[in-house]
Interface confidence: low
């Protein structure tokens, strides 16, 4: 049994980092491995992530972490019973995937404005809760070709347009994603999508 | 119950070496993070240096870079910190520490020894 | 490194009285601070740790709130014991880093 594709790691700076990694065959993950973790300078005894499959040869594994701090690094070990198959490093403030936001809602009766709201994902006392940017993706359900990102570069959690540059009479959806530019970190996953009919008032033809 | 105890401590010349250890019990040793902390007389508390439980990774305070090593033999149960071209502003009560485990990281100092002075004096 | 400023130095209360001591970090910390009480000639007791989070065995008269660069350790009734000089310590960064303390004397 050897590793064919390293173990990475992605921290939400939160509580939850994630790891995955491939094996050489098909691998049954939460029976044959286990990763332990620790954090260097401060440890106990390692810490045991068991864990699961993520297709055939694929294994993921989510390490509880109760909080992080920008100076944390952990030790990685990846184990099939006796045998230590890969030995790494993870420091979760230089590998942040935030969280998605939640309760994605769409406005529509606010005058022929759009009004999107949606939650940050992290508490006020967490660093990332002040550094979070946002990019909302509309789209069209009959049209693939209507397909638009906003840039949400402010911290308020909401994004205003008008009506009128999307489509009226159809059925649009929307979903919004979140990175944090001081730790430089990848995108969060998509929300879940929201949906709605557009519909609006079209101006009076000047004649 | 979790016991600390310092030894060690004593008065010592300027660019002198001294050696302190720290016995400890009434926990699984071999499994904390240890650190030493010291205080000046009537001054505030400064953190000094920190090793891992394996006794693989130390990290320290500037002041003390380059002059102090923190060590540990887990056999005897024992944290030493080995005090090399000592100075005056190195005269302090230089406490053992057993540090909390909040989360899993190694950093509240839930259980101190008694103290062993330095004094570094010509 | 991190720098902890504790205010006041000195706070003259007395028993019963209610003690409010400060603790500004340089910069954040997070809720990554801890209080300690120590009395003379003894070692350091952890009271709060994770800004607001009482250790074990320790009165609910204290208390812990803040984040980010102030915090603040409460003390809501004063009780003889509670005499002493307290160091706030950061654990965000490294070096960890305590506060140059306050002493609660009694008035």
């Known amino acids: 049994m050897k590793v064919l594709q390293e173990p990475t790691c992605v921290s939400d700076y939160m509580s939850i980092s994630t790891c995955e990694w491939k094996m050489n065959g098909p691998t049954n993950c939460s029976t044959e491995l286990r990763l332990l973790y620790q954090l260097v300078f401060l440890l106990s005894e390692a810490h045991t992530c068991i864990p699961e499959n993520n297709g055939g040869a694929g294994c993921v594994c989510h390490l509880l972490m109760d909080d992080v701090v920008s100076a944390d690094n952990y030790t990685l070990d990846l184990w099939a019973g006796q045998q230590l198959l890969w030995k790494g490093s993870f420091k979760p403030s230089e590998h942040v995937k935030p969280r998605a936001p939640g309760n994605l809602t769409v406005h529509t009766n606010v005058s022929d404005t759009l009004l999107l709201t949606w939650s940050n994902p992290y508490p006020p006392d967490n660093y990332l809760y002040n550094h979070l940017t946002y990019a909302v993706n509309i789209w069209s359900e009959n049209d693939p070709a209507d397909f638009r990102i906003y840039n949400v570069t402010y911290l308020e959690p909401s994004l205003r347009i008008a009506a009128s540059t999307l489509k009226s009479g159809i059925s649009y959806r929307a979903r919004v994603r979140a990175w944090a530019q001081c730790y430089n970190t990848t995108w969060s996953e998509w929300s879940p999508s929201t949906k709605w009919h557009n519909s609006y008032r079209e101006p009076f033809e000047q004649h | 119950q979790v016991q600390l105890v310092e030894s060690g401590g004593g008065v010592v010349q300027p660019g002198r070496s001294l050696r302190l250890s720290c016995a400890a019990s009434?926990?699984?040793?071999?499994?904390?993070?240890m650190h030493w902390v010291r205080q000046a007389p009537g001054k505030g508390l400064e953190w000094v240096a920190v090793?891992?439980?394996?006794?693989?990774?130390?990290y320290y305070a500037d002041s003390v870079k380059g002059r102090f090593t923190i060590s540990r033999d887990n056999s005897k149960n024992t944290l030493y910190l080995q005090m090399n071209s000592l100075r005056a502003e190195d005269t302090a009560v230089y406490y053992c520490?057993?540090?909390?485990?909040?989360?899993?990281?190694?950093?509240?100092?839930?259980?101190w020894g008694q103290g062993t002075l330095v004094t570094v004096s010509s | 490194e991190i720098v902890l400023t504790q205010s006041p130095a000195t706070l003259s209360l007395s028993p019963g009285e209610r003690a409010t001591l400060s603790c500004r970090a340089s910069?954040?910390?997070?809720?990554?601070l801890a209080w300690y009480q120590q009395k003379p000639g003894q070692a350091p007791r952890l009271l709060i740790y994770?800004?607001?989070n009482r250790a074990t065995g320790i009165p609910a008269r204290f208390s812990g709130s803040g984040s980010g660069t102030d915090f603040t350790l409460t003390i809501s009734s004063l009780e003889p014991e509670d005499f002493a000089v307290y160091y706030c310590?950061?654990?965000?960064?490294?070096?960890?880093?305590f506060g140059g303390g306050t002493k609660v004397e009694i008035k």
């Open positions: 520490t057993k540090a909390i485990s909040i989360s899993g990281t190694y950093n509240w100092f839930d259980s």
């Open positions: 009434g926990f699984t040793f071999s499994s904390n993070g």
């Open positions: 090793i891992s439980y394996d006794g693989n990774n130390q």
């Open positions: 910069q954040s910390v997070s809720r990554y």
């Open positions: 994770d800004a607001s």
């Open positions: 310590q950061q654990r965000s960064n490294w070096p960890l880093t």
